[in-house]
């Protein structure tokens, strides 16, 4: 590949370096839908914003394959737990690609909040992060899921979040 | 833009390149001050450094705009809690711009730490660790703002601090 | 440095960043060993990675000087706690460097996730997350100790975790 | 100014029961722990145990456990002691003591209330 | 239960001398650098005073004379220049562990 081939390369390179992907999807009123799927996310207001990336029904869609540090945050809590509620919340990022049929788990959290709420009605909150890197190909997605549900509170944006950043 | 400004601009791109902003700062005795202001932090020794960033008064000053993922981790802990069970621990990354008088949370995270102290011992450890990419305009500062400090613990650097990097 | 020079540099750093230096470990059966050494993972099936780091003995080992964003978590979990343990759990990420006889302490945390279990029975779980940016010469290495290990529960590579990538 | 005011003595027979009030004043009341400790004659001091105003949440001394109960009245800002199946033992100076800004030690302390058990 | 030791039982000590209290704990009251030890002071028909929280932090408003320290299980109480209204019986507590416990107080008096 001559210099002019590689001058290309490195204009190119320069322009997509100022839009190296990045994303930060905000927790809404909306994001807990109850149904079974994942959690669904603001992608414009406030601090939410998509840069090279896209988004579709509650996943972060790859546009440019490589490694990329993905991480979510999930604010807990309750007044005492749901009765009958499994004393643990599983909190995890994962993957669907066209190549497999079911999603992969990628990073993923176990906590047991509700042993600090020894009476049903204490009022108790948690918060669990994960972040890490992944290799993704373009078309692939990665989405968030907490079980169970419910036990996420939203409020602004600023406690429950979903993010990207190729590095 | 011809061959020569491009080529003074990947010069340019390079060097800067070099620089990508980043910066770790790191807990100390004096971090807690009890005035109700932000924790204050350690800029240069140990492990602490700023490289295109600035400091003032507890707060990362942004020198170039654009996409940065901050975090902070803070080291909890005591012996009981001041109110119990009921103790709630907020612990925030918040920005302070010239064009708005009030600081925007940005990443927010509450705890309910003192459930983990057993009825044996009333001693408890937790960590709250909080990491996002938000966009920042040169001159806009990051702080860091714990309620209640009380239960901060700090000790060598290591188990509470604050960074960015950009993106 | 003349314009041929310069090239040369350019093509070389457009080079070096397609593989700017990256890394995800993952928890496996073999991480815990008992032995007080530092965990021990996985670097090549599933999500494991190396890419411009390599591994050696549970370090990850640097090539190529720089500030690094490192991070780990680790899946802790049990039924009850093991009788006699203090109710502290310490997880690091310690420096190891030629020119210095012991690990130095990069990010360090310490949780009391026993407390969350009320009974000596009760099923508990609980997750720990260090990140930060420290700067690591070529030659430095870097592992991730938890004491006590007996408390840190490994399934598939996605709930315990040790990876780096250069900012 | 801080201040905590007991209820006066009392006399009772073994077997029944005594309650101590103690009301807080010049302070944010929910945002300080309550202790409540007893002196018997030629004896130290004895920790009972606390209580958090803002929940009402206790911790009792296990000595005391069962037969001591605290309770809180935010809308007056008093906690209570009730000492049950009173005993000649059970004589002493009741205080309340209130947990500091580090809430690790009493830093005011009520004047003192005076149970005298006799039959 | 921790169980706190204070020696001697009585002191009697001139004007202006120096006093010296030692509290000796079953097992040590520090948690993270920090030790979990009160003293206190109390004179006849008043309640306990706080005078030393921490181990070695003077409460507001005690006066300078007296200070505090020691850490793990061994802690002493110093009063520098023995004045006539520092005569009293005073405590130390430990307060890591539930049950809280006092010592069992040493009387100052005036030689």
């Known amino acids: 590949d001559g210099p002019a081939g590689s001058w290309e390369q490195l204009i190119q390179e320069r322009r997509s370096h100022e839009v190296n992907p990045a994303a930060h999807l905000t927790g809404a009123n909306s994001s807990l839908t109850g149904s079974g799927g994942p959690l669904l996310w603001e992608t414009q207001l406030g601090l939410a914003f998509l840069r090279g990336l896209s988004y579709h029904d509650g996943a972060l869609v790859v546009t440019k394959a490589g490694y990329y540090y993905i991480y979510s945050k999930v604010q807990l809590g309750g007044v005492g737990c749901p009765l009958g509620l499994a004393s643990t919340i599983t909190h995890g990022l994962y993957k669907r690609t066209p190549r497999y049929p079911e999603e992969l788990e990628l990073l993923v959290s176990q906590q047991s909040p509700c042993g600090r709420a020894t009476s049903s009605s204490r009022v108790w909150w948690d918060s669990s992060f994960l972040g890490g890197v992944v290799h993704l190909e373009a078309g692939e997605e990665v989405v968030v899921r907490v079980l169970d549900e419910r036990l996420v509170r939203l409020r602004d944006g600023t406690r429950s979040y979903f993010g990207a950043f190729m590095v | 833009d011809g061959p020569a400004g491009s080529w003074e601009q990947l010069i340019q791109e390079r060097r800067s390149h070099e620089v990508n902003p980043a910066a770790h700062l790191t807990g100390a005795n004096s971090s807690l001050t009890g005035s109700g202001g932000p924790l204050l932090w350690e800029t240069q020794l140990g492990l602490a450094f700023l490289r295109g960033l600035s400091y003032h008064d507890g707060a990362l000053v942004v020198t170039k705009a654009g996409y940065y993922y901050i975090y902070s981790k803070v080291q909890l802990g005591g012996v009981g809690c001041p109110l119990g069970l009921a103790s709630t621990i907020t612990h925030g990354l918040y920005k302070r711009t010239p064009r708005y008088p009030e600081e925007l949370e940005l990443l927010v995270s509450q705890q309910s730490p003192c459930g983990r102290a057993t009825s044996s011992s009333r001693v408890w450890w937790d960590s709250s660790f909080l990491g996002g990419v938000v966009h920042l305009e040169a001159g806009e500062e990051v702080v860091v703002r714990v309620l209640d400090e009380r239960l901060v613990r700090l000790r060598d650097g290591t188990r509470s601090y604050f960074g960015a990097f950009m993106v | 440095d003349g314009p041929a020079g310069s090239w040369e540099q350019l093509i070389q750093e457009r080079r070096s960043h397609e593989v700017n230096p990256a890394a995800h470990l993952t928890g496996a059966n073999s991480s815990l060993t008992g032995s007080g050494g530092p965990l021990l993972w996985e670097t090549q099936l599933g999500l494991a990675f190396l890419r411009g780091l390599s591994y050696h003995d549970g370090a990850l080992v640097v090539t190529k000087a720089g500030y690094y964003y490192i991070y780990s978590k680790v899946q802790l979990g049990g039924v009850g706690c093991p009788l006699g343990l203090a109710s502290t759990i310490t997880h690091g990420l310690y420096k190891r460097t030629p020119r210095y006889p012991e690990e130095l302490e990069l990010l360090v945390s310490q949780q009391s996730p026993c407390g969350r279990a009320t009974s000596s029975s009760r099923v508990w779980w609980d997750s720990s997350f260090l990140g930060g940016v420290v700067h690591l010469e070529a030659g430095e290495e870097v592992v991730v100790r938890v004491l006590d290990e007996r408390l840190v529960r490994l399934r598939d590579g996605t709930r315990s975790y040790f990876g780096a990538f250069m900012v | 100014q801080v201040q905590l005011v007991q209820s006066g003595a009392e006399v009772k027979k073994p077997g029944a029961s005594v309650k101590v009030s103690c009301k807080a004043s010049?302070?944010?009341?929910?945002?300080?722990?309550m202790n409540w400790v007893r002196k018997a004659p030629g004896q130290g001091l004895e920790w009972m145990g606390r209580?958090?105003?803002?929940?009402?949440?206790?911790n009792y001394n296990q000595k005391f456990m069962g037969r001591a109960t605290f309770t809180v009245d935010r809308s007056t800002s008093t906690v209570y002691m009730e000492l049950s199946s009173l005993r000649s033992e059970d004589t002493a100076v009741y205080y309340c003591?209130?947990?500091?800004?580090?809430?690790?030690?009493?830093?005011?302390w009520g004047q003192g209330t005076l149970v005298t058990v006799s039959s | 239960d921790i169980v706190m030791t204070q020696s001697p039982d009585s002191l009697a000590v001139s004007l202006g001398e120096r006093a010296t209290i030692n509290c000796k704990a079953s097992?040590?009251?520090?948690?993270?650098?920090?030790?979990?030890m009160n003293w206190y002071q109390q004179k006849p028909g008043q309640p306990p005073k706080l005078l030393i929280y921490?181990?070695?932090n003077l409460e507001s408003g005690v006066p300078d004379r007296f200070s505090g320290s020691g850490s793990g299980t061994d802690f002493t109480l110093t009063i520098s220049s023995l004045q006539a209204e520092d005569v009293a019986v005073y405590y130390c507590?430990?307060?890591?562990?539930?049950?809280?416990?006092f010592g069992q107080g040493t009387k100052v008096e005036i030689k």
């Open positions: 507590q430990q307060s890591i562990e539930d049950p809280w416990t």
């Open positions: 209580i958090y105003p803002v929940s009402g949440e206790t």
């Open positions: 010049g302070y944010t009341f929910i945002d300080h722990i």
């Open positions: 097992q040590s009251v520090d948690f993270d650098g920090d030790s979990y």
């Open positions: 921490s181990a070695s």
């Open positions: 003591g209130r947990g500091s800004y580090y809430w690790n030690a009493m830093d005011y």
